[in-house]
Amino acid sequence: GMEVRWCATSDPEQHKCGNMSEAFREAGIQPSLLCVRGTSADHCVQLIAAQEADAITLDGGAIYEAGKEHGLKPVVGEVYDQEVGTSYYAVAVVRRSSHVTIDTLKGVKSCHTGINRTVGWNVPVGYLVESGRLSVMGCDVLKAVSDYFGGSCVPGAGETSYSESLCRLCRGDSSGEGVCDKSPLERYYDYSGAFRCLAEGAGDVAFVKHSTVLENTDGKTLPSWGQALLSQDFELLCRDGSRADVTEWRQCHLARVPAHAVVVRADTDGGLIFRLLNEGQRLFSHEGSSFQMFSSEAYGQKDLLFKDSTSELVPIATQTYEAWLGHEYLHAMKGLLCDPNRLPPYLRWCVLSTPEIQKCGDMAVAFRRQRLKPEIQCVSAKSPQHCMERIQAEQVDAVTLSGEDIYTAGKTYGLVPAAGEHYAPEDSSNSYYVVAVVRRDSSHAFTLDELRGKRSCHAGFGSPAGWDVPVGALIQRGFIRPKDCDVLTAVSEFFNASCVPVNNPKNYPSSLCALCVGDEQGRNKCVGNSQERYYGYRGAFRCLVENAGDVAFVRHTTVFDNTNGHNSEPWAAELRSEDYELLCPNGARAEVSQFAACNLAQIPPHAVMVRPDTNIFTVYGLLDKAQDLFGDDHNKNGFKMFDSSNYHGQDLLFKDATVRAVPVGEKTTYRGWLGLDYVAALEGMSSQQC
């Protein structure tokens, strides 16, 4: 008949499993329970996947691995005797008197419950990596953490290569024995120990459970170190950079940590497993019963088969590992789980030209000299699209792309951003807002919804802020409705007249050039260069200023660059920025200074795009370590990452304007990186590519 094979990971667990099997059999519980011996939780997961076992209880990290790598699903969850049900919360605690926030943890002293412990290590480290605050090169998480904090106590890290830093704050017992042991010998071990490390001033932040502070303050603790501690003297660090009272852990935490759960193969009936265990817990979970499901005392161990603190087992409704773990914990695990043995030795970078091949070759050599991992290899392609194809086909791994190409890479080829470029705050030519500028005119004021029949000024055909975004946005919002994919004709019929300078026109609608003026002699009308006086962002604004047009589609800086004395040309010399306004997508008008809230889209920075199965944290980890050495254009280390002047080119591998490579943080998809408005505009345009 039917049987369920439970996987045990040790002799004591096998012993308890045998007793449980016997107890269930005697009670007539069906299906029958058998026990299979595995060597570890990982081994058991492999046995279940191979259909040699059926079930095991796992912690969050193991559920993540089992689900992601082997397709197992959680079907029964543990509930513990506490108010938060099937989970608890991992928090970061600081002294109220300190000024530490989640964004200023670099260099502070840290207290952890123990190496590889959930709230003391896995969640905080995973969260810091996943959020981009902590960069990890070559999967060496221990090195990354030891470099990040200004000394730590991580009980159990004494056997690692980074014990000097990771055990620096540990003190052992009263006689100095057991320093950094993953045991009560180390006074700063476990939840209370990590909190003590903070309370005694050894560390500046403690990574503990939501209940730890309240359990060890306000006279609730017996040991002398905690007697005088007040919970009000401590605060929690929130993910958004703020801080909160220690009672606010539901809103302010690093992650909700899921309870342990029973996992099975995807084809196993979860209801059957719950019915089996539910029968068992009904008979064998209370005091005095012949077998104790939720106790391990009799076997001289803790947490065998189930956690000893389990009060009951409950069925899991949505049987996916993602739903059970929750997005916070899931994200933290993504940041943490990096197997050095599965890390490819090379990162193959896509290059598009001879100068780029040369720069990439030099980068590979420079990185190798500094032992940066993974090593760079250079693979050439004919075009950005060809790069995308080759990345999808696993012939290449990474390429830096512009906004429009990121859209194609994500939408058509399924690629994701692994790192982004960051430009100087004052650099408006590389990442900027697209705005619709109008004259301030109370008598003839119109809104973005009333552009039909108006005269429009554009920097040029195909320019991001002058054409792609505004036209895409108007198509997406349903104002412009191209027939037969003919966007040009549709735009020409939407506006009364326009100036949209163009190079090498073919069949170009005349009304798109009707407002253009050409050069001083009236020649070169509508040409896509500066001979046309209304060409470019400055020219489009001039078209508005000189009353040729009613609206100009430009960058957010264009008005400032050409008013209040910033442009001495006769047409601009007397202009004042307050005489102009912006049209907002919500139908309002706004001051030109309100561009961040009133724009058609933000043109995103370039990003490094990879396959979704590529570990983005190792890509960013490599680039982050590399830029410490090679990021400054004046560095003396023999290679300049963000400068192409040695190669007689520009923007090779990265834009020359890049100041730093940055993590993608939450923007882990092409849509997230590009932003909804920009994507909407591109979708408006791409809907017309027939």
Epitope: K483, D484, C485, D486, T489, A497, P505, K506, N507, Y508, P509, S510, S511, C513, A514, L515, G522, K525, C526, C690
Partner: antibody, heavy 118, light 107 residues
Framework: EVQLVQSGAEVKKPGESLKISCKGS????????LHWVRQMPGKGLEWMGR????????SYNQIFKDQVTISADKSISTAYLQWSSLKASDTAMYYC???????????WGQGTTVTVSS | DIQMTQSPSSLSASVGDRVTITCKAS??????VAWYQQKPGKAPKLLIY???TRHAGVPSRFSGSGSGTDFTLTISSLQPEDFATYYC?????????FGQGTKVEIK
């Protein structure tokens, strides 16, 4: 050099159908619009409509909308103007003309004379 | 539709004369006006577009001017081969519309 060669003169009776052609050469046929223009005897020029040979999209002058059909076969670089039922008032010279940088007629064919008479 | 009104409908001139033809649009067409030349039994030829831009290969004696609603074609020194009918056309909005033509004849 750009050349537009139109089919020969036609003499038809009212009610008959007709399809005249215009073959483009010396350029990439699908890159430019093709227009049809009517010139009635001793009169001026009237724009009838155009086709984008790349995708077959057409645009008509309303007064000709239900009178004629414009089509193209890009495989043989040829555009067509056709009537399903001719009238005496369709007697005219018909020109095909290729667009240029802008979307109005630049280069013209030699014309096709259509005579409709009972 | 935009109406284009040409004047005169015909004129007589001698070789070497300066000839001016005007065209009026029924509404503002900015500078979107083209001029064509048509000789008897031949197809029209584009001379000028954007009111003043000469098409490739058109002699410099042909010039155009105007914007808004009023436009002019000027032949600075009439040559024997210039005797023909001239049409203006607005290329601002479809349907493209033509003037009724001006016939330039030998005096």
């Amino acid at each position: 050099e750009v050349q537009l060669v139109q089919s020969g003169a036609e003499v038809k009776k009212p009610g008959e159908s007709l399809k005249i052609s215009c073959k483009g050469s010396g350029y990439s046929f699908t890159d430019y619009y093709l227009h049809w223009v009517r010139q009635m005897p001793g009169k001026g020029l009237e724009w009838m409509g155009r086709i984008n040979p790349y995708n077959g999209a057409t645009s008509y002058n309303q007064i000709f909308k239900d009178q004629v059909t414009i089509s193209a076969d890009k495989s043989i670089s040829t555009a067509y103007l056709q009537w399903s039922s001719l009238k005496a008032s369709d007697t005219a010279m018909y020109y095909c003309a290729r667009g240029g940088d802008y979307d109005f007629p630049w280069y013209w064919g030699q014309g096709t004379t259509v005579t409709v008479s009972s | 539709d935009i109406q284009m009104t040409q004047s005169p409908s015909s004129l007589s001139a001698s070789v070497g004369d300066r000839v001016t033809i005007t065209c009026k649009a029924s509404q503002d067409v900015y500078a979107a006006v083209a001029w064509y030349q048509q000789k008897p039994g031949k197809a029209p030829k584009l001379l000028i577009y954007w009111a003043s831009t000469r098409h490739a290969g058109v002699p410099s004696r042909f010039s155009g001017s105007g914007s808004g609603t009023d436009f002019t074609l000027t032949i600075s020194s009439l040559q024997p081969e210039d005797f023909a009918t001239y049409y203006c056309q607005q290329h601002y909005r479809t349907p493209w519309t033509f003037g009724q033509g001006t016939k330039v004849e030998i005096k």
